[in-house]
């Protein structure tokens, strides 16, 4: 999980010590340390909710917070990745979306987070401890997971507040990803703090801004989703899994809101804007080495295929390999 | 090269079942799930559903709950659709379909089986 | 289910013209519209999805747009290998469904 550090609250250096030259280096290393801490560590929230008129009827919502293209996301209950789960839905934000019962409707919410309609009754109905996972594939950052549940006494109606869930695991294309950058940049603090150790370190004082203060990010998520950030993350062990469907890995996936006007509704770019397959099957979304993509076979002991992303934006046959030929 | 190879024409009676096959080569049978898709003479395409070829679990369209089932065998990269209880309304022309994720999309498709039921 | 609706139902044409054919959703279902071309006696092959993105080797005469519930295939100057029928289908969740189909004939 990214560390809640924000940008410390600097003392000014005494009046005269420095002059203006020495305020900028002294700013600098700090911005550079919390880009150091911060940058290439997204976070993906998830909140449940329970609808009042239908008890049976759940609404999840995750999202992502994160400056990558989102590629995939996967959303599964009964548990996190690898911990057997089962899928719901998977989506992409280019070849569209597949959900599957008791999941009923499953959609864009904004370009990087997505909500999950689930209704039944009896057996494949969910409950109130179910677990449910969301599962993002983005580049450069990798593949990120979390999951939340309902708390046991949630009246009807109420959600959970979105739970920023801990990393389950930062995939190496990630790290690779922001590596580059962050290496130089680390590099050159560590510099400029040798360079400042004879002088007087300045005052810190704990940051007392709110969730809504400026992080080192490129844009703002919402307030609700900042508002999660400070949230206690538990994920809950279901005794409420689908008494007809086995276990599976878990896994998600991506779709556009369905009344997001084209205009806002621009798919993510770059080498993994689209998953070309080879397809992993549906129920398990195992990350492959390159950290990207992943496998999805429906129950264990199966395990589904890798899946491999290719940058060309043209669609599946646009490379070579089994999607490459027409 | 991805091949899907269906078997030949059927000629069935009423009453009848028939199972066609359609067997995949040029990639990894379980990177894709097996759609089948109905094209009665002269008209549209209707989607039947589908199998993930990792463990068989299978998606209907409601339509054809109770008529179709679809099966696959890895070992042999080969998928099933068996069809029963015919009447004149199935005889049409069927395909299977590679779909790739997340499996909304028929990126492959067999050359089809025709099956014609008659007395 | 969401129903696709095409139009034409038949169009006739000379190669080096301009057609358009139009799908109707019927509800939302963003830019999830795919295009599929069958010749005649063949096997329909996915030409376009995600309402504009054309698979390999499509020509760059053809292009898709739209979003919500309506969309177009256009094909600018018409070659003889465009000739067959047309398919739209939503793929934004199942059960996947198809529009009626449009059959291009030469004029």
């Known amino acids: 999980m990214r560390t809640e550090a924000q940008v410390p609250a600097l003392q000014p250096p005494e009046p005269g010590l420095e002059g203006a030259m020495g305020h900028r280096t002294l700013v600098l290393p700090w911005v550079l340390l919390t880009l150091c801490v911060t940058a290439g560590t997204p976070e993906v929230w998830v909140q449940v909710r329970m609808e009042a008129t239908e008890l049976s009827s759940f609404t999840i919502r995750c999202g992502f917070l994160g400056s990558g293209s989102i590629s995939l996301v996967t959303v599964s209950w009964g548990g996190p990745n690898g911990a057997g789960g089962t899928t719901l839905a998977v989506l992409h934000p280019e070849r569209g979306i597949r959900q599957w019962a008791p999941a009923r409707q499953a959609r864009w919410e904004t370009q990087s987070s997505i909500s999950l309609i689930l209704e039944g009754s009896g057996a494949s109905s969910p409950c109130a401890n179910t677990t449910f996972c969301c599962k993002f594939a983005s580049f450069p950052e990798g593949s990120w997971e979390a999951c939340g549940s309902l708390p046991p006494s949630s009246d009807p109606g109420l959600s959970a507040p979105p739970t920023p869930a801990p990393i389950l695991r930062a995939d190496l294309a990630g790290i690779l990803g922001v590596s580059g950058v962050l290496l130089f940049g680390c590099v050159y603090l560590l510099h400029l703090l040798r360079r400042h150790k004879h002088r007087p370190a300045p005052r810190l004082q704990p940051s007392r801004t709110s969730p809504q203060a400026p992080r080192a990010r490129a844009w703002a998520p919402s307030q609700a989703s900042q508002a999660a950030l400070h949230v206690p993350y538990a994920t809950i062990n279901t005794s409420c899994r689908p008494a007809t469907l086995d276990t599976a890995h878990p896994h998600g996936g991506p779709s556009w809101w369905a009344s997001l006007p084209t205009h806002a509704a621009h798919r993510p770019q770059g080498p993994a804007a689209w998953a070309s397959t080879p397809i992993p099957a549906r129920g398990s979304f195992v990350s492959v080495e390159n950290g990207l993509y992943a496998q999805a076979g429906e129950r264990p002991p199966h395990t589904g295929p890798g899946l491999t992303l290719f940058p060309d934006p043209r669609g599946p046959r646009a490379m070579e390999g089994p999607l490459g030929v027409r | 090269e991805v091949q899907l190879q269906q078997s030949g024409p059927e000629l069935v009676k009423p009453g009848a079942s028939v199972k066609i096959s359609c067997k995949a080569s040029?990639?990894?049978?379980?990177?894709?799930?097996m759609s089948w898709v109905k094209q009665s003479h002269g008209k549209s395409l209707e989607w039947i559903g589908d199998?993930?070829?990792?463990?068989?679990?299978?998606s209907y369209n409601q339509k054809f709950k109770g008529k179709a089932t679809l099966t696959v065998d890895k070992s042999s990269s080969t998928a099933y659709m068996e069809l029963r209880s015919l009447t004149s309304e199935d005889s049409a022309v069927y395909y299977c379909?590679?779909?790739?994720?997340?499996?909304?999309?028929?990126?492959?498709w067999g050359q089809g089986t025709s099956v014609t039921v008659s007395s | 289910d969401i129903q696709m609706t095409q139009s034409p139902a038949s169009l006739s044409a000379s190669v080096g013209e301009t057609v358009t054919i139009t799908c109707r959703a019927s509800?939302?279902?963003?830019?999830?519209l795919a295009w599929y071309q069958q010749k005649q006696g063949k096997s329909p092959q996915l030409l376009v999805y995600?309402?504009?993105t054309l698979t390999e080797d499509v020509p760059s005469r053809f292009s898709g747009s739209g979003s919500g519930t309506q969309f177009s295939l256009k094909i600018n100057s018409l070659q003889p290998e465009d000739f067959g029928s047309y398919y739209c289908?939503?793929?934004?969740?199942?059960?996947?469904?198809f529009g009626g189909g449009t059959k291009l004939e030469l004029k």
């Open positions: 379909a590679a779909s790739g994720l997340p499996y909304v999309l028929m990126d492959y």
């Open positions: 040029g990639y990894t049978f379980t990177d894709y799930y």
């Open positions: 199998v993930n070829p990792n463990n068989g679990d299978t």
């Open positions: 509800e939302n279902i963003n830019s999830y």
């Open positions: 995600n309402t504009k």
């Open positions: 289908q939503h793929h934004y969740g199942t059960p996947l469904t």
